[in-house]
Amino acid sequence: DTEIKVNPPQDFEIVDPGYLGYLYLQWQPPLSLDHFKECTVEYELKYRNIGSETWKTIITKNLHYKDGFDLNKGIEAKIHTLLPWQCTNGSEVQSSWAETTYWISPQGIPETKVQDMDCVYYNWQYLLCSWKPGIGVLLDTNYNLFYWYEGLDHALQCVDYIKADGQNIGCRFPYLEASDYKDFYICVNGSSENKPIRSSYFTFQLQNIVKPLPPVYLTFTRESSCEIKLKWSIPLGPIPARCFDYEIEIREDDTTLVTATVENETYTLKTTNETRQLCFVVRSKVNIYCSDDGIWSEWSDKQCWEGEDLSKKTLLR
C-alpha cells in the first residue's frame, strides 16, 4: 500500500494592498493534484502578529483570505493542504507547511513616532484624533495621517489637520459613511529633513470610542409625598435611545450624595418632606447593546430646586 501524500500550496504570500493593516493572504493549489480530481481540497491557514502567543486558524476551500493586522509588528503565516478522509479511504492527509512572513521595514528610531495617540468619536458623528510629536524630533518634522476602512477604495489622508507650532498634532475627519462596526485603520507617518520618522499604526472600531453629548431638559416631577421622579431627554444626534446608559448624581440639602446608573431617561428618588434642596446632574454613555466600550459624556447642566414648593406636582428649572 503506497502512502498517500499531498504537496503544500504554492506561491503562498502576504500581500499589502495599502489598507494600513488589512492584508491579503493568498496561495495557489498544490502541484500534482491530478490524483484527487474528484476531491475538494481544503487548506488550513494559521497566522498571527509576531510576538503573539496564539495563532488564528482558518480552514477554507478558497485560495485567499483577508484580515487585519498590527503593522507595528511583523506578521507570520503558514498553510498546508488538507485531503479529507473521503478522498483517501481513511484518515485525513495533511501536507507539510508552507510558511511566509511580512513586515514593513521600520524607518527611524521608535522615539520618533507619534506619542499618546487619542481618538474620540464625538456623538457618533465627528471623529477627532490627536497626538504628541515624537520625543526629540525637530520642528521641521511633520506628521501625516492616513485612514482606511472597508468600503473605501483606497486609504485617504486627513482633510483637516490640527496644528501646533506649524506641526500637525491632530486630525478632524470628514464624514465617515458606513464606518462603524468594522475595523478602522490609521497610519501616522512623518517626514523630516534631519532624520527618518517611524510610522505608527492604529486599529479600532468607531462605535467603541463614542463620547456622547450630555443629556438635556432635566426636570423634576412629584410622584407621591415621598417620591420624586427625575427625568431628562436623550441628547440631540444620531444615537438612538436604546444605546444609552446614564449616570446620575443627586445631592440633597448639600449633604447626601446619591449616584446611580440607569438605562432609561427617568429615575425615581425617595425623599422626605424635610428635603429643602435637590440638585442633580446626568451624563450618558453608549451601552453594551451598541458597543463594547465607550466614553462618558460631560455632565449635564445642573438642575436644582430649593424652597417650599418641592411638594408641587412639576418642578422645572
Epitope: Y122, Y126, L156, V159, I162, K163, P174, E298
Partner: antibody
Framework: QVQLVQSGAEVKKPGSSVKVSCKAS????????MNWVRQAPGQGLEWMGR????????DYNQNFKDRVTITADKSTSTAYMELSSLRSEDTAVYYC????????????WGQGTLVTVSS | DIVMTQSPDSLAVSLGERATINCRAS??????????ANWYQQKPGQPPKLLIY???RQGSGVPDRFSGSGSGTDFTLTISSLQAEDVAVYYC?????????FGGGTKLEIK
C-alpha cells in the same frame, strides 16, 4: 443645546474699530472651528475668516487686507472678531458660525450683530 | 478665489412642485474624494441654516424633501415638494479653499 450668543448692535464712526464677541455653549468649544461671516444690508454672505480654538490656528480672507483680527478664549468659550479702519461699506450684520472641519460646512450660527458705520 | 455662481437669481414655484437651484464653481471643489460644497437657507431676519454639506449630506434636522447632488464644479439643490415655509434665499458655498466663498443667492418664492 448648542448656542452661540453674540454681543449687541454697535454704531461706529469711520476709521474706528469694532470688536464683536461670540459666547459658545452646549458643546466642547475647542473641538470645532469658529467662522466669522458678514452680510451687508440686502446683500449676500461674505466669509471673513476662522479660528481653530484647539490650537489657535487662523485663516483670514485676504480681501480684508489685515483689518480683521480673530481670537478665541478657551477658558470662557468665547470667540472675538475685531475689524479696524471701519468705513461705511462695513455696515453689515456680522455672524459667528461653528463648523466641524472643512467637509461639514457651518452647522450653527449666532444671532448676528449689526454694526453700523456712520459719521 | 473660487467663484460660486448660482442660477437662477430668483425662482417662483407652485406649492407641492419641485424646485431646483444650480451652483457652478469656477474650479473643481473636489478633494480627498469629497465635494466641499454646502447649501444654506436664509429666511428674513434670521441667520442662515445649513441644509446640505459635502454636496449631498443632509444637515441635522433638515426635512427629507431637501437633497443635494453634483461633484466637481456643478451642484444642484432640489426641494422635491415645495412647502410654504421654504420661501427663503438659498446660498451655495465652497469650503475647499480659503477664502470660503458663497454664491450670490437664489430667492425662492411661491408662484
Amino acid at each position: 443645546q448648542v448656542q452661540l450668543v453674540q454681543s449687541g448692535a454697535e454704531v461706529k464712526k469711520p476709521g474706528s474699530s469694532v470688536k464683536v464677541s461670540c459666547k459658545a455653549s452646549g458643546y466642547t468649544f475647542s473641538n470645532y472651528l469658529m467662522n466669522w461671516v458678514r452680510q451687508a444690508p440686502g446683500q449676500g454672505l461674505e466669509w471673513m475668516g476662522r479660528i481653530d480654538p484647539y490650537d489657535g490656528d487662523i485663516d483670514y480672507n485676504q480681501n480684508f487686507k489685515d483689518r480683521v483680527t480673530i481670537t478665541a478664549d478657551k477658558s470662557t468659550s468665547t470667540a472675538y472678531m475685531e475689524l479696524s479702519s471701519l468705513r461705511s461699506e462695513d455696515t453689515a450684520v456680522y455672524y459667528c458660525a461653528r463648523g466641524y472641519g472643512t467637509a461639514y460646512g457651518v452647522d450653527y450660527w449666532g444671532q448676528g450683530t449689526l454694526v453700523t458705520v456712520s459719521s | 478665489d473660487i467663484v460660486m455662481t448660482q442660477s437662477p437669481d430668483s425662482l417662483a414655484v407652485s406649492l407641492g412642485e419641485r424646485a431646483t437651484i444650480n451652483c457652478r464653481a469656477s474650479e473643481s471643489v473636489d478633494n480627498y474624494g469629497i465635494s466641499f460644497a454646502n447649501w444654506y437657507q436664509q429666511k428674513p431676519g434670521q441667520p442662515p441654516k445649513l441644509l446640505i454639506y459635502a454636496a449631498s449630506r443632509q444637515g441635522s434636522g433638515v426635512p427629507d424633501r431637501f437633497s443635494g447632488s453634483g461633484s466637481g464644479t456643478d451642484f444642484t439643490l432640489t426641494i422635491s415638494s415645495l412647502q410654504a415655509e421654504d420661501v427663503a434665499v438659498y446660498y451655495c458655498q465652497q469650503s475647499k479653499e480659503v477664502p470660503w466663498t458663497f454664491g450670490g443667492g437664489t430667492k425662492l418664492e411661491i408662484k
